[in-house]
C-alpha cells in the first residue's frame, strides 16, 4: 500500500483476498485522506470485472443498494458519516465468485479513486495417507497412496524418503464443483528390506499455515528371510551345552519353527525349543548338517547349518556358546 | 437542458446580507456539487464555497467563513448563499457554477448568468 | 492564500498552437491541485472546459488540453479557431479551497 502524505487522496486495499468456498469474506477497501486535504465522498461503488453496472453502491443520500442483497453488506459505511471504509462482506463464497473486483470511491473535487482486489476462492483439502500393503513381486508397485480432497486449487503432493521411490500422481473434480481430489502413489519394487521403513507423504497448499505431513510405515508381505546363528566352528567334545537361534525375518511373523538334519529327524544330542535348538554335550565326534525350516503365511524357508564336534580340548577363549 | 437560473440584482447597504438564490434543472439536484464564485468589477474569480446538495455538506474558502452560509432546498432543487455584515469590497457579480464529473476529475461544468449585489451606502 | 498567475493576454493565429500556463506562488504545480480551465467568451456565461488537470469535460472539442508543463498547469490549444476567442481562467485547488488565476484574455487574429 503506498505510504501515507503523497499529496492525493488513495485508496488503499491489498491485491489480493483469500476467502473459503461457503464462509463469508470481507474485501477491505480504504480511502486515505492526507493531513488538512479536504475531500467529500458521495458515494461508494463496488463492480466486478466483465460484468456491466454495478453489484453494490452506497449513496451519501440514498444508502446502500445491492445486486444479491442477501450476499452483500458494507460493513463500515453508514448514512450521515463520512464515507471513508467502502469494505464489503460477501456471504456463502462461490466458485463462480473468483476474479477480479474495483472499489471505487467518488470524490470531491479529487474526482474518482478506484482500486482492484482479486478475489481468490479457496477450499481447504482435507489430508490422508494410507500404506498399501504389498507382496513381493519383482515390479514396482503402489507402495503408499496419499490423497488430498476437495482443494481448490489443487494441492500439491511431494513424496520424502530415502528408500527412492517414485510418484504418480492424479487429480479428479471433488464432491464441490471448482474443487479437487489429489491422488499420488508412491511406486516402488517391494523387498524386506523396506518393510517397516517410512515414507512422507506432504501435502501443501494456500489454505495452510505450513505444509502437511503424513508418515506412511510401509508393510510388504514376504516369506521367512532364514539364518541361524550361534556356531562359531570351535565345538569340542566334553564341553557344556550349546544353543544355536534360527533367526527368520517375516511378514507376517513366523507360525511354526522346524529343526531336522539333512538324515532325517534330529539326533538325540539336539533337542528342538521353538526357534532355539539345545545342543546337549556329547562324547564322540560329530558332524552334522542342520535345516531350520520357518513357515509364515506366505510359505516355508529354510537354512542350513554344519556343525562339528571335534576332539581336543578346548582353550579358554573357545569352545562352544556356554549357558 | 441543465440550467441554472440565478436571482435578481441586489443592492445593500454596508452591514446588510444578502441572501442569492440558485435554481437548477435538468438533472438530478441532489447527487450534484454547487460551487459558488464571485467577480469583482475589473478583476478575476473568487471562489467562495462549496456545497454537496443532497446532503448539505459545505466547504468554505476560509476568508468568507463566519460570514458566508450556504444552503439546499432540495424540494425546489434550489441552492443558496447567503453573504452577511456585508462591505464595500462585496460589490461584485455573484455566480453559482455545478461541478460536473469527467469520471476522473470534476469541472465546473454549467454556471448561473450570476447576480450582481452592489454594496453602497 | 496562494496566488494563481496567468499570462495577462495571449495571441494566436488561427490554425495556430498556443499554449496558456497556470503558475503557482506556493512552487510547483502537481496533480494535486486538479487544474481546472474555465472559458468565457464576450457576452456568454463561463464554461468549464477540463478538470482533474487533464480531463476534457464532455463536448470540448479535441483542440483543446490540459497537462503539466514543468512546473506549471497548461492548457494548449492546437489548431486555433476565431470562436476560441475569450478569457481563459484557471483554477488549483488546495487542499481545502479553490483559487482562481486572473485570467489570459486570449485573441485569435
Known amino acids: 500500500w503506498p505510504p501515507p502524505g503523497t499529496g492525493d487522496v488513495v485508496v488503499q486495499a491489498p491485491t489480493q483476498v483469500p476467502g473459503f468456498l461457503g464462509d463469508s469474506v470481507t474485501l477491505p477497501c480504504y480511502l486515505q485522506v492526507p493531513n488538512m486535504e479536504v475531500t467529500h465522498v458521495s458515494q461508494l461503488t463496488w463492480a466486478r470485472h466483465g460484468e456491466s453496472g454495478s453489484m453494490a453502491v452506497f449513496h451519501q443520500t440514498q444508502g446502500p443498494s445491492y445486486s444479491e442483497s442477501k450476499r452483500l453488506e458494507f460493513v463500515a459505511a453508514r448514512l450521515g458519516a463520512e464515507l471513508r471504509n467502502a469494505s464489503l462482506r460477501m456471504f456463502g463464497l462461490r466458485v463462480e465468485d473468483e476474479g477480479n473486483y474495483t472499489c471505487l470511491f467518488v470524490t470531491f473535487p479529487q474526482g474518482s479513486r478506484s482500486v482492484d482486489i482479486w478475489l481468490r476462492v479457496l477450499a481447504k483439502p482435507q489430508n490422508t495417507a494410507e500404506v498399501q500393503k504389498v507382496q513381493l513381486t519383482g515390479e514396482p508397485v503402489p507402495m503408499a497412496r496419499c490423497v488430498s480432497t476437495g482443494g481448490r486449487p489443487p494441492a500439491q503432493i511431494t513424496w520424502h524418503s530415502d528408500l527412492g521411490g517414485m510418484p504418480n500422481t492424479s487429480q479428479v473434480p471433488g464432491f464441490l464443483s471448482g474443487t479437487v481430489t489429489v491422488t499420488s502413489l508412491w511406486i516402488l519394487v517391494p523387498s524386506s528390506q523396506v518393510d517397516g521403513k517410512n515414507v512422507t507423504c506432504k501435502v501443501e497448499h494456500e489454505s495452510f499455515e505450513k505444509p502437511q505431513l503424513l508418515t506412511v510405515n510401509l508393510t510388504v508381505y514376504y516369506p521367512p528371510e532364514v539364518s541361524i546363528s550361534g556356531y562359531d566352528n570351535n565345538w569340542y567334545l566334553g564341553q557344556n551345552e550349546a544353543t544355536l537361534t534360527c533367526d527368520a525375518r517375516s511378514n507376517p511373523e513366523p507360525t511354526g519353527y522346524n529343526w531336522s538334519t539333512t538324515m532325517g529327524p534330529l539326533p538325540p544330542f539336539a533337542v528342538a525349543q521353538g526357534a532355539q535348538l539345545l545342543i546337549r554335550p556329547v562324547d564322540k565326534p560329530i558332524n552334522t548338517t542342520l535345516i531350520c525350516n520357518v513357515t509364515n503365511a506366505l510359505g516355508a524357508r529354510q537354512a542350513e547349518l554344519t556343525v562339528q564336534v571335534k576332539e581336543g580340548p578346548p582353550s579358554e577363549h573357545s569352545g562352544i556358546s556356554r549357558n | 437542458q441543465v440550467q441554472l437560473v440565478q436571482s435578481g440584482a441586489e443592492v445593500k447597504k454596508p452591514g446588510a446580507s444578502v441572501k442569492v438564490s440558485c435554481k437548477a434543472s435538468?438533472?438530478?439536484?441532489?447527487?450534484?456539487?454547487i460551487s459558488w464564485v464571485r467577480q469583482a468589477p475589473g478583476q478575476g474569480l473568487e471562489w467562495i464555497a462549496w456545497?454537496?446538495?443532497?446532503?448539505?455538506?459545505?466547504n468554505y474558502n476560509q476568508k468568507f467563513t463566519g460570514r458566508v452560509t450556504m444552503t439546499t432546498d432540495t424540494s425546489t432543487s434550489t441552492a443558496y448563499m447567503e453573504l452577511r455584515s456585508l462591505r464595500s469590497d462585496d460589490t461584485a457579480v455573484y455566480y453559482c457554477?455545478?461541478?460536473?464529473?469527467?469520471?476522473?476529475?470534476?469541472?465546473?461544468?454549467?454556471w448561473g448568468q450570476g447576480t450582481t449585489v452592489t454594496v453602497s451606502s | 492564500q496562494a496566488v494563481v498567475t496567468q499570462e495577462p493576454s495571449l495571441t494566436v493565429s488561427p490554425g495556430g498552437t498556443v499554449t496558456l500556463t497556470c503558475r503557482s506562488s506556493?512552487?510547483?504545480?502537481?496533480?494535486?491541485?486538479?487544474a481546472n480551465w474555465v472559458q468565457q467568451k464576450p457576452g456568454q456565461a463561463f464554461r468549464g472546459l477540463i478538470g482533474?488537470?487533464?480531463n476534457r469535460a464532455p463536448g470540448v472539442p479535441a483542440r483543446f488540453s490540459g497537462s503539466l508543463l514543468g512546473d506549471k498547469a497548461a492548457l494548449t490549444l492546437s489548431g486555433a479557431q476565431p470562436e476560441d476567442e475569450a478569457e481563459y481562467y484557471c483554477?488549483?485547488?488546495?487542499?481545502?479551497?479553490?483559487?482562481f488565476g486572473g485570467g489570459t484574455k486570449l485573441t485569435v487574429l
Open positions: 506556493t512552487g510547483a504545480v502537481t496533480t494535486s491541485n486538479y
Open positions: 483554477a488549483l485547488w488546495y487542499s481545502n479551497h479553490f483559487v
Open positions: 482533474g488537470t487533464n
Open positions: 457554477a455545478r461541478h460536473g464529473s469527467t469520471g476522473r476529475g470534476w469541472y465546473f461544468a454549467v
Open positions: 456545497i454537496y446538495a443532497g446532503t448539505g455538506d459545505t
Open positions: 435538468g438533472y438530478t439536484f441532489t447527487s450534484s456539487y
